[in-house]
């Protein structure tokens, strides 16, 4: 019999390398049964996790799983760090493993793009 507890499927020690200036979507896979839980994102700052209330979030529903998405429009250098999603379900707080974003900049990327490329939008150039 399948559990009807809420589950958050972020893999332990998962990480993403992303470029400053790119749009990015950080997904928290959420499994639930009847009522969709209230999910939030926070960013780790030492031992505390600071709730991200000023960022755009959205839900993407798929057949067997849903995704609570944190949007970066665009990524800035200070978005570097570790993030966690958490769900409130029947008065219980369920926390995911943390996922780490490594933000790199064009100036520190291994191949330095041309001046024209730098002026072009990165989501066309760095797919």
């Amino acid at each position: 019999k399948e559990s009807c507890d809420v589950q958050l499927y972020i893999k332990r020690q998962s990480e993403h390398s992303i470029l400053a200036g790119d749009p990015f979507e950080l997904e928290c896979p959420v499994k639930y049964c009847a009522n969709r839980p209230h999910v939030t994102w926070c960013k780790l700052n030492g031992t505390t996790c600071v709730k991200l209330e000023d960022r755009q979030t959205s839900w993407k529903e798929e057949k067997n799983i849903s995704f609570f998405i944190l949007h970066f429009e665009p990524v800035l250098p200070n978005d570097n760090g570790s993030y966690r999603c958490s769900a409130n379900f029947q008065s219980n707080l369920i926390e995911s493993h943390s996922t780490t974003l490594y933000v790199t900049d064009v100036k520190s990327a291994s191949e330095r793009p041309s001046k024209d490329e730098m002026a072009s939008r990165p989501w066309l150039l760095y797919r």
């Epitope: 400053a20 200036g21 749009p23 949007h71 665009p74 250098p77 200070n78 900049d105 002026a119 939008r121």
Partner: antibody, heavy 119, light 107 residues
Framework: EVQLQQSGPELVQPGASVKISCKAS????????MIWVKQSHGKSLEWIGN????????TYNQKFKGKATLTVDKSSSTAYMGLPSLTSEDSAVYYC????????????WGQGTTLTVSS | NIVMTQSPKSMSMSVGERVTLSCKAS??????VSWYQQKPEQSPKLLIY???NRYTGVPDRFTGSGSATDFTLTISSVQAEDLADYHC?????????FGAGTKLELI
Amino acid sequence: EVQLQQSGPELVQPGASVKISCKASGYTFTDYYMIWVKQSHGKSLEWIGNINPNNGGTTYNQKFKGKATLTVDKSSSTAYMGLPSLTSEDSAVYYCARGGLRPLYFDYWGQGTTLTVSS
Amino acid sequence: NIVMTQSPKSMSMSVGERVTLSCKASENVDTYVSWYQQKPEQSPKLLIYGASNRYTGVPDRFTGSGSATDFTLTISSVQAEDLADYHCGQSYSYPLTFGAGTKLELI
């Protein structure tokens, strides 16, 4: 030549709403972020928010969340900023600017739209 | 929020003089600082991005320098057309923030 053409000045009563437009030309509209900036009293600049014309994704300054609404119309290469329930504090010049260099530097600016809220 | 503090608030210079404008960030912003020139009754124009990169078409008398928290815009030999407000801004962290500006006046 890249151009951002903003709508004309607005004189409105307190409590009214406005929608300022910014028509882009001379580049591919969906390739660059559009940014909105407020300038009060001809001096300091305040970032309102960004919109990605590709998908409509936004990031707002918390101060303007619920105050400004950023949208785009890809078919006409136009960005919009809606401001509801206006007060005298909203009187300012509003600029749209293109986020042309990563991560987010503003390389082209509209001419500005002057909003005056007065009874 | 990162506070960008510009100094001085205004300065009066003669044509040909060297001008140094300061911008200090309340916390480390690496080199994610830009400088904008705003002439009277005009919209801002990008001069410098990434603390030290001169934007296309900007005269080479304008030079940006600095990193972390202290940034400088230098005009090596000020011209009459440089009469303007100069704004610094950071794009290291949300919310993006600007300094209050420095007004450059000519004697």
